[in-house]
């Protein structure tokens, strides 16, 4: 899978789009996860409701949101009040059963606000119009890694 | 109606190659995963391995990966199962199936085939 | 993988009576992914019951599953003469996915 690099700035909004085969991954819950490392595990930060037909409903853990819209195949996590320490590698991922299958692996970078070392006035963003989805560049690396289960004992 | 059909019975040597097919109707063959099971003579069934036709993602078994290709014809809507060197030990019957699913949940295996007997032997 | 160990391997019992079978998990399995399927001489494998205790289409109320866990169990509750054939447990929480060893319902 290829990453998709996202930017957002530090105390913004970011939202991550992931797209998925909604037919194949039909009755799955998703989830958003943080990975620990380069090879390491992925922590999950947020999923999607546990009653699959209520997985349009917004569910929060922290600044971190989720829903999904299972008829179009669009999981949507949105990150908000971003942070630098919110910087890092993530993977939106299908449940089923014990097994999370990869379907997005994103990299978050947070860039610093300009107007945090300078006096912003009167100027204020609102939270809902602070919302981005960032520059998806991705990384044409030939790092296609087939999504494997490798069998648990 | 919905069924799976599978190919005819084979015949086969040690160290030849062999593809059975199972082919899928009365449903909308891309978006549900076809698995397939052994049960060689007189014995259990033996989860193999599965296939989602709509773009070929697939899993094995540990036990039978590298010893068999799962592979599916969308166009066709036809699953096949294949060995690129037979052994004795391969004579059984093998059934295809498709996974079922529900709003939310899974259905188990909800359609088989009718079972394809291969024979090896010198 | 999870190893799903099927008790009593065979059993002998009269038409009218009732038949208890056990599918014991290696690993907790959640119910949503265990199925149970009948399977007579000649014939393919037939589905009864999914997500542990849910009749597929067509399967008579005799049939019923319970369970959670690592311990589900298949009960019919009075044998008709074509309940006789070999039950299987299978779970799909897991790859690889895999089957019981089978209990054989035989006539007594």
């Known amino acids: 899978l290829n990453t998709t690099v996202l930017q957002g700035m530090a105390g913004q909004s970011l939202r991550v789009s992931c797209t998925y085969d909604a037919l194949k991954h039909w009755g799955r819950r998703k989830a958003w996860c943080r990975q620990l490392g380069e090879e390491g595990p992925c922590q999950r930060v947020v999923s999607t409701h546990g009653v699959w037909l209520l997985a349009f409903l917004k569910k929060r853990n922290g600044s971190t949101v989720i829903a999904d819209d299972t008829l179009a195949g669009t999981v949507t996590i949105t990150l908000k009040n971003l942070q630098a320490g919110d910087a890092g590698l993530y993977q939106c991922q299908s449940l089923r059963g014990r097994e999370a299958e990869v379907l997005q692996k994103v990299l978050v970078e947070v860039l610093e606000d300009p107007l945090d070392d300078q006096d912003a006035g009167d100027l204020w963003v609102p939270e809902e119009s602070s919302s981005f989805e960032g520059a998806q560049v991705e990384h044409s690396t030939s790092r296609n890694q087939e999504t494997s289960f490798p069998p648990t004992s | 109606e919905v069924q799976l059909v599978q190919s005819g019975a084979e015949v086969k040597k040690p160290g030849e190659s062999l593809k059975i097919s199972c082919k899928g109707s009365g449903y909308s063959f891309t978006t549900y995963w076809i698995g397939w099971v052994r049960q060689m003579p007189g014995k259990g069934l033996e989860w193999m391995g599965i296939?989602?036709?709509?773009?070929?993602?697939?899993r094995y078994s540990p036990s039978f990966q590298g010893q068999v290709t799962i592979s599916a014809d969308k166009s066709i809507s036809t699953a096949y199962l294949q060995w690129s060197s037979l052994k004795a030990s391969d004579t059984a019957m093998y059934y295809c199936a498709r996974a079922g699913h529900y709003d939310g949940g899974h259905l188990g295996m909800d359609v088989w085939g009718q079972g394809t007997t291969v024979t090896v032997s010198s | 993988e999870i190893v799903l160990t099927q008790s009593p391997g065979t059993l002998s019992l009269s038409p009218g009576e009732r038949a208890t079978l056990s599918c014991r998990a290696s690993q907790s399995v959640s119910s949503d992914y265990l199925a149970w399927y009948q399977q007579k001489p000649g014939q393919a494998p037939r589905l009864l019951i999914y997500g542990a205790s849910s009749r597929a289409t067509g399967i008579p109320d005799r049939f019923s599953g319970s369970g959670s866990g690592t311990d589900f169990t298949l009960t019919i509750s009075r044998l008709e003469p074509e309940d006789f054939a070999v039950y299987y447990c299978?779970?799909?929480?897991?790859?690889?996915?895999?089957f019981g060893g089978g209990t054989k319902v035989e006539i007594k």
């Open positions: 299978q779970q799909d929480y897991s790859y690889p996915w895999t």
């Open positions: 296939i989602y036709p709509g773009d070929s993602d697939t």
